[in-house]
Amino acid sequence: EINGSANYEMFIFHNGGVQILCKYPDIVQQFKMQLLKGGQILCDLTKTKGSGNTVSIKSLKFCHSQLSNNSVSFFLYNLDHSHANYYFCNLSIFDPPPFKVTLTGGYLHIYESQLCCQLKF
């Protein structure tokens, strides 16, 4: 398992909500990405492929999420001070092998200026 701080901007604020960006290498084909708040799983997204190369995307703990070819974004809305915490992107790489787990994270600071608007984006 590899642990570290995200070396990119992990938190992007929008109108009272936050987009939490969890990156993964372009070469990764199949994976599970979990968003952890402290030690608690808040959200997850799993991408796998079947024998016909058909893609399956699943969420056991559903959050609004967005998948690109090198990142998963999880969106949290209606921010308040209780959201301030350490957040971690827990990436399990299934494909290509070998199986590997990486954990990257950062602290989400909540400032008054980020609580003003409760619009969904």
Epitope: I27, Q29, T48, G50, S51, G52, T54, S56, P97
Partner: antibody, heavy 117, light 111 residues
């Protein structure tokens, strides 16, 4: 240890039906796509069907589409193949296989289906 | 559907000698940096066993005398030093798209 055990094969008349089962153990069944692959006596391997982790995606070979239905019960760790309108050319050993992300990495011993009058 | 062909249909090789099996696909199996091509071994009376995936990566536990090579439409499985336990039928298989298909198989025997 991963184990896949097929059952339900046998002799059936043309036009008849059979339901194959595959009991899985030794791994988290609900984490994997599963497939059926068949092999006619003395012949090669032919892919039949697959199903994703929760059963929401299914795919079929053109040879069986509209006649066979794949399903799974994750609570019972069991894969199924419902075979209707069977034909003589469906005679084969049917293997249950686990799609291990980039290949069929575990196979059952197979169950023989014979379609004959 | 992608058609997989194999050559030869069968071959007999002396113990300790090299065996080479060829597989050709009717369209390229290369997507990004991966060739969606696997090799299986089937011994008499047994289910198949995964040997090689992504054209050249050995499955865990497979002896290093087995190697895979090739890209695009042309692939090769090589057994560098044939052992008695390698007598089997070998199948190539693609998972580039649906339906996945297998080659017709190549039977390997001892000369």
């Amino acid at each position: 240890e991963v184990q896949l055990v097929e059952s339900g094969g046998g002799l059936v008349q043309p036009g008849g039906s059979l339901r194959l089962s595959c009991a899985a153990s030794g791994f988290t069944f609900s984490d994997y796509w599963m497939d059926w692959v068949r092999q006619a006596p003395g012949k090669g391997l032919v892919w039949v069907s697959n199903i994703d982790e929760d059963g929401s995606i299914t795919e079929y070979s053109p040879f069986v589409k509209g006649r066979f239905t794949i399903s799974r019960d994750n609570a019972k760790n069991t894969l199924y193949l419902q075979m209707n309108s069977l034909r003589a050319e469906d005679t084969a050993v049917y293997y249950c296989t686990r799609w291990g992300r980039f290949g069929f990495d575990s196979w059952g011993q197979g169950t023989l289906v014979t379609v004959s009058s | 559907d992608i058609v997989m062909t194999q050559s030869p249909d069968s071959l007999a090789v002396s113990l300790g000698e090299r065996a080479t099996i060829n597989c050709k696909s009717s369209q390229s199996l290369l997507s990004g940096s991966f060739n969606y091509l696997t090799w299986y071994q089937q011994k008499p009376g047994q289910p198949p066993k995964l040997l090689i995936f992504y054209a050249s990566t050995r499955q865990t536990g497979v002896p290093d005398r087995f190697s895979g090579s090739g890209s695009g439409t042309d692939f090769t499985l090589t057994i560098s030093s044939l052992q008695a336990e390698d007598v089997a039928v070998y199948y190539c298989h693609h998972h580039y798209n649906a339906p996945p298909t297998f080659g017709p198989g190549t039977k390997v025997d001892i000369k």
